[in-house]
């Protein structure tokens, strides 16, 4: 009686359980009465990364430098090549097929999280007694310089994009 | 952004030692890192790869002499049973082979009995 | 991966060109994934060129790297005394078989 159903990691076929290609290889031909199941090994830059009767490898996928991507995982046998950003840039989407360039903050707005190869910068807003007078994709907010300390007055109020003027205290006549 | 190795000594034949390859200024959840190493007058030899996801990949003749590990800061090649023949400067790079690197200066490593 | 690289040494006169050859017995990855460095006596080596022909950073213009698959070449035009030194060319595969040439060692006269 031929089978309907076949194990784990076979296919029907010919009303025949043939075993199944390991990760990393190709179905050369499907086994017979007599002859077990080919198999060949992936080529270079090719994989499969499952159980398979497929007669062709998949390609690696390509990090294209002139996109601004570079490899971060070579793909090997059984896996795909896993790509990033260069350095300054991050992903467009989650399969990465191209980058961006960081985000810089304004100023008046600080870095509240520095971008990765798959996140962009998150700006925030340089709340009271912060500032930044720079646009940058690195620089946090900074304190206002703190008068008291150095013994001055605060001559020039600071804003979300300038730091405090300080000066002498007027002296008593 | 640096790479150094360090941990290069000398050792007796079959005393396991382990180099360390210290990064700083990257990331080596970005970055795979590669061990080449080269004996005194000779040419480099292609060790083998730390991956970014942490799986190691390894030459066919270095499989079972060395293994790679890493932190989050730094990898490194352990020599399993050192003989005379791995008496050589180790190097560590950022990359992979082929690809753009940043070399460290290496690390002397001397098995004498 | 074997990486076989013209016989060393290879003589070059000041201010001639000098060509370096690299046979891979299989594709590199990306059919680009090589490298050219130069090292000098207790030096690291230097990375000259990678993916087969982009000049690494602060490398003079000099240095040109060509070819895809299996076949790649090294050309230094207008040699310098400084550039005597032993050329490896590197490749990289699938599954990291990666792998170095011999060396190659550039004799300046």
């Known amino acids: 009686e031929p089978p309907t159903a076949c194990r784990e990691k076979q296919y029907l076929i010919n009303s025949q359980c043939c075993s199944l290609c390991q990760p990393g290889q190709k179905l050369v031909s499907d086994c017979t009465e007599f002859t077990e199941t080919e198999c060949l090994p992936c080529g270079e830059s090719e994989f499969l990364d499952t159980w398979n009767r497929e007669t062709h490898c998949h390609q690696h996928k390509y990090c294209d430098p002139n996109l601004g991507l570079r490899v971060q995982q070579k793909g090997t046998s059984e896996t795909d090549t896993i790509c990033t950003c260069e350095e300054g840039w991050h992903c467009t989407s989650e399969a990465c097929e191209s980058c961006v360039l960081h985000r810089s903050c304004s100023p008046g707005f600080g870095v509240k999280q520095i971008a990765t190869g798959v996140s962009d910068t998150i700006c925030e807003p340089c709340p009271v007694g912060f500032f930044s007078n720079v646009s940058s994709a690195f620089e946090k907010c900074h304190p206002w310089t703190s008068c008291e300390t150095k013994d001055l007055v605060v001559q020039q109020a600071g804003t979300n994009k300038t730091d405090v003027v300080c000066g002498p205290q007027d002296r008593l006549r | 952004q640096s790479v150094e190795e360090s941990g290069g000594r000398l050792v007796t034949p079959g005393t396991p030692l382990t180099l360390t390859c210290t990064v700083s200024?990257?990331?080596?959840?970005?970055?795979?890192m590669s061990w080449v190493r080269q004996a005194p007058g000779k040419g480099l030899e292609y060790i083998g790869v730390?991956?970014?996801?942490?799986s190691a990949h390894y030459a066919t003749w270095a499989k079972g002499r060395f293994t790679i590990s890493k932190t989050s800061t730094t990898v490194d090649l352990k020599i399993t049973s050192p003989t005379t023949a791995d008496t050589a400067t180790y190097f560590c790079?950022?990359?992979?082979?082929?690809?753009?690197?940043?070399w460290g200066p290496g690390t002397l490593v001397t098995v004498s009995s | 991966a074997v990486l076989t690289q013209t016989p060393s040494p290879v003589s070059a006169a000041v201010g001639g060109t000098v060509s370096i050859s690299c046979q891979s017995s299989?594709?590199?990855?990306?059919?680009?994934?090589l490298s050219w460095f130069q090292q000098k006596p207790g030096q690291p080596p230097k990375q000259l060129i990678y993916?087969?022909?982009t000049l690494a950073s602060g490398v003079p213009s000099r240095f040109k790297g060509s070819g895809s698959g299996t076949e790649f070449t090294l050309t230094i035009s207008d040699v310098q005394c400084a550039d005597a030194a032993t050329y490896y060319c590197a490749g990289g595969y699938t599954d990291s078989d990666d792998a170095f040439g011999g060396g190659t060692e550039v004799v300046v006269k």
């Open positions: 993916l087969a022909s």
């Open positions: 200024g990257f990331s080596l959840s970005s970055y795979a």
């Open positions: 790079a950022r990359g992979y082979i082929g690809s753009p690197n940043l």
């Open positions: 730390m991956n970014t996801g942490g």
């Open positions: 299989k594709s590199v990855y990306y059919n680009n994934y």
